[in-house]
């Protein structure tokens, strides 16, 4: 507890002090006071530097004195032999004695009193910036007119802060400008403009005179500009050392002017104005800016249009242009949007064809569609080459965005038919010689595949069974073979309207218009054993002449069997119709004259007993295409005959091409493109 005065006596005083003693006293007087310590008696063993016995006076970390020996007063009117005055309110006194004393020493008597200190004069560091006023136990600071005392109660400054400038143009100067600015002041000015405008500060060199920097380059008085996280300055010296035009890139600016106690100069004056915030002219690749300007500022709007083949992708939507606005923060809106190369995506697959996996699907990439050769070809031309166009579509020079169509190649057998070994007027054949050959199991008959959805046959084959089961791709019609072959399911049977339906078909004598089409439920996949036959052209090139050769095939009756196990075939010449008329009907169901012969029929055969027979009905009479020797077309369909092994009658397909085409067109399912 601090006291105003006190007494300190050495141990056993006034008797001799003991050996080997160390004792300390902590003196504390109230704050605002100093301590006056004085000794009235001093009798301590003398030694050099008071090394043996001593009384030590310590203030803080400083030794104020170390005493030993005997002292007496110099002043007859005063008992004081030694005294200490400290301007602090704490003091420590330490007494030490060693292990022996040569004589008897009585020690010391000392007193302390609290004394007033003059804070205004007693210290090196002046406590007040302007006026210091001392009183007993303390001091206070005061200020000259127009200055005020800061919260620290020590520093005086002028009231130069708190001004907020919101006008788009203005002038700000240091206090008293051009008279010397106040010392020991911190002036803060705030410029706050509306968003989208940046504060631009302009100064003239001659309008700036602030106390220069010290030898280390630190400004003693300084002017600083702070805009967000950017700082300009500190500036000081004679003549403005910074840029005369400061673009702050911010709508908010704080101006801080800090002065110390000394060296006042005239100060500074500046002008400011609000500039619409500029946005950088950014380099956005693969695009054009409209309007094109040298400089863009707040609220400017540009349309950024991608070059051909480039697009803006935002989410899943692609666009060719976008708008960008110069924002209040000096940044462009939609700055994340970029013009990227158009991506045409993975090209669509096509039926019976393929497209190589593209290395790239971006603008300018090229892909090639091919058909599954040699069974399919590209119907709609264009070569199959597509490039990724600017609109994001794969485009062909001929077809545009339309996909190529792979359609079956017709009339080309994988292996040509060769009459190897003569078997009952015909030869063993392989289905690869007649890949268009269709087998009907009820009734036992044939047909010809003319495209992936249609089978051509004789009307009399399907008139009694409108849901025939058909097979393709097998040479043998043994059950185990058919189980492995392709079964075709009919969707609808179309019999020629000119075909006369009878109550008792067995007694038929009129086979005119013996032609029918079977529409299939599913498309047939072509390959080496399944491939369509062509239809005849409508030109006169496709008119048959007597002697023209054609091929017939089927699993019909042979000399040995009612039904052939393996496909049989024969090459027959076209004959005049009268040759067929002349042959006597084997098992007539009516008069010979009752049998009808029309121009819709072709007569063929008569050579070496080669002929079609029961069970071959509906199969094609295949003739080499006069305009393309690699192909065969269905000139006829096995229809009827007077007698097996002589001449046979075939439906003249050329006469029905229009009906065939019309029926197929009217009953086609639109392709799912």
């Amino acid at each position: 507890e601090p006291t105003m005065y006190g007494e300190i006596l050495s141990p056993n005083y006034p008797q001799a002090y003991p050996s080997e003693v160390e004792k300390s006293w902590d003196i504390e007087v109230p704050e605002g006071y100093g301590i006056h310590l004085y000794f009235t008696h001093l009798d301590i063993e003398l030694s050099e530097n008071c090394a043996y016995d001593s009384v030590q006076i310590i203030s803080g970390d400083t030794e104020e004195g170390r005493l030993c020996g005997q002292r007496s007063s110099n002043n007859p009117h005063s008992p004081i032999v030694e005294e200490f005055q400290v301007p602090y309110n704490k003091l420590q006194v330490i007494f030490k004695s060693d292990f022996s004393n040569e004589e008897r020493f009585t020690g010391f008597a000392a007193y302390y009193v609290a004394t007033d200190i003059n804070e205004c004069t007693d210290f090196v560091d002046v406590p007040c910036s302007h006026f210091c006023n001392n009183f007993i136990g303390g001091y206070f600071c005061s200020c000259p007119p127009e200055y005020f005392l800061h919260d620290d109660m020590k520093n005086c400054g002028v009231n130069c802060s708190g001004d907020v400038f919101t006008a788009l143009i203005g002038e700000i100067a240091s206090p008293n400008y051009p008279k010397p600015y106040p010392e020991n002041s911190r002036c803060e000015y705030q410029i706050r403009l509306e968003k989208g405008f940046q504060v631009v500060v302009t100064l003239r060199r001659e309008d700036f005179d602030v106390e220069a920097a010290d030898s280390a380059g630190n400004c003693l008085d300084s002017l600083v500009f702070v805009a967000g996280d950017r700082q300009f300055g500190p500036y000081c010296g004679h003549g403005f050392p910074g840029p005369l035009n400061i673009e702050t890139k911010s709508n908010a600016l704080d101006i801080i002017f800090q002065t110390d106690l000394t060296g006042q100069k005239k100060g500074w004056k500046l002008r400011y104005h609000g500039d619409p915030m500029p946005c950088p002219k950014e380099d956005t690749p693969n695009s054009v800016w409209e309007p094109a300007k040298a400089k863009y500022v707040f609220r400017d709007v540009v349309q950024i249009t991608c070059l051909d083949g480039f697009e803006v992708v935002e989410g899943r939507v692609g666009a060719t242009s976008f708008y960008s606005t110069c924002q209040s923060n000096g940044k462009w809106s939609n700055s994340k949007l970029k013009c990227q190369p158009v991506d045409c995506g993975i090209p669509e697959s096509i039926e019976n064809g393929k497209v190589e996996d593209p290395e790239s699907t971006l603008f300018g990439s090229v892909i090639r569609y091919t058909c599954e050769e040699p069974y399919y070809y590209m119907e709609n031309g264009g070569g199959g080459e597509y490039h990724c166009a600017g609109n994001g579509s794969w485009v062909n020079e001929v077809l545009g965005p339309e996909l190529p169509k792979c359609v079956p190649v017709c009339g080309v057998p994988r292996e040509p038919f060769e009459e190897k070994q003569r078997i009952i007027g015909g030869s063993d054949a392989d289905i690869k010689n007649f890949p268009w050959q269709v087998f009907f199991d009820n009734p036992w008959a044939g047909g010809a595949l003319i495209n992936e959805y249609w089978v051509l046959t004789a009307a009399h084959v399907v008139e009694g069974n409108r849901e025939p089961t058909m097979y393709v791709g097998s040479t043998s019609v043994q059950t185990s073979r058919l189980a492995k072959s392709k079964m075709l399911t009919p969707e609808h049977v179309f019999i020629h309207p000119g075909w006369k339906l009878l109550e008792v078909p067995e007694g038929r004598t009129n086979f005119d218009n013996d032609i029918a089409l079977v529409r299939l439920k599913d498309p047939v996949k072509m390959g080496p054993t399944v491939s369509p036959i062509c239809l005849p052209g409508t030109s006169s090139d496709y008119n048959l002449m007597d002697g023209d050769l054609g091929l017939i095939s089927g699993w019909g009756r042979t000399e040995k069997r009612d039904r052939a196990v393996r496909l049989k075939a024969a090459r027959l010449p076209v004959a005049p119709l009268r040759k067929c008329k002349e042959v006597k009907v084997e098992k007539p169901t009516a008069d010979a004259e009752a049998y009808v012969f029309t121009p819709n029929m072709i007569c063929a055969g008569g050579e070496k007993g080669m002929d079609s027979c029961k069970g071959d009905s509906g199969g094609a009479f295949a003739v080499q295409d006069p305009n393309d020797k690699t192909k065969f077309y269905a000139a006829g369909l096995v229809s009827w005959g007077p007698q097996c092994g002589t001449y046979g009658l075939y439906t003249r397909v050329k006469n029905y091409v229009d009906w065939i085409m019309k029926t197929m067109q009217e009953n086609s399912t639109p392709r799912e493109d």
Epitope: F439, D441, W444, T475, S476, V477, Q478, T479, S480, R481, L482, A483, K560, R561, R563, A564, V565, R566
Partner: antibody, heavy 119, light 107 residues
């Protein structure tokens, strides 16, 4: 109709082999697929194998693989089935059967040959 | 191999009865199924093929139905000549397999 005439009954000792013949008449063997089926006394029918003329290969049931050989002599229109390493459970009637056409599994059956395996 | 399970194994019936025999395949065989009749000491005789097609010369009282894995043979009115053993057969693959047989005997 094709007729199939098989060789007569045989009695064999275990470990021996038996060769059953099947003569085709009314058609040529080259036109046909010949299958062999057996039936143990009082038991069901069991398919043994066939010659596939399309592929030119003989297909055997897994059970008989390595013990059965099916051959054909087209000059005499005769098919043969030889079963080796006979055991008592091979006692059965062995049938030759021609495959049918267009959904019919079988066309003609031989009269059957009884093979008895007994020591 | 495809397994064929026939039921029942024995069936006692009288002349004039309607008789049904079922056959189940271990996997789908579409319609590649046949039914045979066999009399003692004779070779089997084809009755039905393609699951439901009647072989020529077979009386119309015999009928077949089913596809996939479930098949039936029906004799609409049993005749004295019909007492025999009946087998189903699958032929969807070269490894033909037969059912174990159903013996139809006089009650």
């Amino acid at each position: 109709q094709v007729q199939l005439v098989q060789s007569g009954a045989e009695v064999k000792k275990p470990g021996a082999s038996v060769k059953v013949s099947c003569k085709v008449s009314g058609d040529t063997l080259t036109e046909l697929s010949m299958h062999w089926v057996r039936q143990a006394p009082g038991k069901g029918l069991e398919w043994m194998g066939t010659f596939d003329p399309e592929e030119g290969e003989t297909i055997y049931a897994q059970k008989f693989q390595g013990r059965v050989t099916m051959t054909e002599d087209t000059s005499t229109d005769t098919a043969y089935m030889e079963l080796s390493s006979l055991r008592s459970e091979d006692t059965a009637v062995y049938y030759c059967v021609t495959e049918g056409l267009a959904w019919r599994p079988t066309d003609s059956w031989g009269q059957g040959t009884l093979v008895t395996v007994s020591s | 191999d495809i397994q064929m399970t026939q039921s029942p194994s024995t069936l006692s019936a009288s002349v004039g009865d309607r008789v049904t025999i079922t056959c189940r395949a271990s996997q789908s065989i579409s319609s590649w199924l046949a039914w045979y009749q066999q009399k003692p000491g004779k070779a089997p005789k084809l009755l039905i093929y393609k699951a439901s097609s009647l072989e020529s010369g077979v009386p119309s009282r015999f009928s077949g139905s089913g596809s996939g894995t479930e098949f039936t043979l029906t004799i609409s009115s049993l005749q004295p000549d019909d007492f025999a053993t009946y087998y189903c057969q699958q032929y969807s693959s070269y490894a033909w397999t037969f059912g174990q047989g159903t013996k139809v005997e006089i009650k």
